[in-house]
Amino acid sequence: GSERTCCPVNWVEHERSCYWFSRSGKAWADADNYCRLEDAHLVVVTSWEEQKFVQHHIGPVNTWMGLHDQNGPWKWVDGTDYETGFKNWRPEQPDDWYGHGLGGGEDCAHFTDDGRWNDDVCQRPYRWVCETELDKASQEPPLL
């Protein structure tokens, strides 16, 4: 594949990454799959600067990111290390709340209305953000 040099149509470029902001809602797994099919991943927040950029674009709306603990440990979908990485949880979060009665706790992270993070039931139909890095090789063959 060739190296991607500019963002696809309807994606927003920022700091050598491309972002796509949904306007509909999906469960976390469906959102994750949507991004993968776009040769991207759910957004991975690695800095306060990136947090502010995403927050500006999504507004005060619950929005999935690429962070989950469905297998126990918190993991970013692109392999970024959770322990040493940027975190922006709301106070008292994550809390793995069981009181929703839907089964299990809360295993998927989302931006809340003030941008800070919360863990919630992964089946909730929230908006989502896809991200892909400009410097990574595209899956598409080069144009001849």
Partner: antibody, heavy 114, light 107 residues
């Protein structure tokens, strides 16, 4: 490297008290729920109690409700289990475990006997 | 409370055998099921969570499947280090509950 180290076990008479501790390291302690699980001699595993990352939610097995209290100190990366009104049937190895059991400590022996 | 029933309680097998352990929940628990391995005098070790997701560092000879009420743990080719007791556990709702265990012994 994730490490969980339990301490505080020992021999106590029925009706007595013990406080177990679990020292955690190698991960962001406040991001994870923590649990106590016990195993009586020659028996299987029994979940005892869980606590959410910031202590908002606490859950107990019926067998220990009203007698045991789970707590944590995120500043000290420590989990606790205060055990009061101990009974002979509380005799077991007590393990602390992270989240839904991704990591376990080595266990601490609690023996309740007269 | 949700009851978890494992079968068999014990089994004898030889090195190289394919071993299957089943776990049945008394009600639908979706995929909120974990499997653990425990050797004598040691703490349990997590093998699988979310019914089928292999934990980091666990060899691929272990696999899990199932959803709802019926689940299986399979060891594709039993090795000497796999002789141990295996437990399933539901975390769908509190109180969390374990199966009674399946002891895998050398034939």
């Amino acid at each position: 490297e994730v490490q969980l180290v339990e301490s505080g076990g020992g021999l106590v008479k029925p009706g007595g008290s013990l406080r177990l501790s679990c020292a955690a390291s190698g991960f962001t302690f406040s991001s994870y729920s923590m649990n106590w699980v016990r195993q009586a001699p020659g028996k299987g595993l029994e979940w005892v109690s869980s606590i959410s990352g910031s202590s908002t939610y606490k859950y107990y097995a019926d067998s220990v409700k009203g007698r045991f209290t789970i707590s944590r100190d995120n500043a000290k990366n420590s989990l606790y289990l205060q055990m009061n009104s101990l009974r002979t049937e509380d005799t077991a190895v007590y393990y602390c475990a992270r989240d839904r059991g991704s990591y376990w400590g080595q266990g601490t022996q609690v023996t309740v006997s007269s | 409370d949700i009851q978890m029933t494992q079968s068999p309680s014990s089994l004898s097998a030889s090195v190289g055998d394919r071993v299957t352990i089943t776990c049945r929940a008394s009600q639908d628990i979706s995929n909120y099921l974990a499997w653990f391995q425990q050797k004598p005098g040691k703490a349990p070790k997590s093998l699988i969570s979310a019914a089928s997701s292999l934990q980091s560092g666990v060899p691929s000879k272990f696999s899990g499947s199932g959803s709802g009420t019926d689940f299986t743990l399979t060891i594709s080719s039993l090795q000497p280090e796999d002789f141990a007791t295996y437990y399933c556990q539901q975390y769908h709702s509190y109180p969390w509950t374990f199966g009674q265990g399946t002891k895998v012994e050398i034939n």
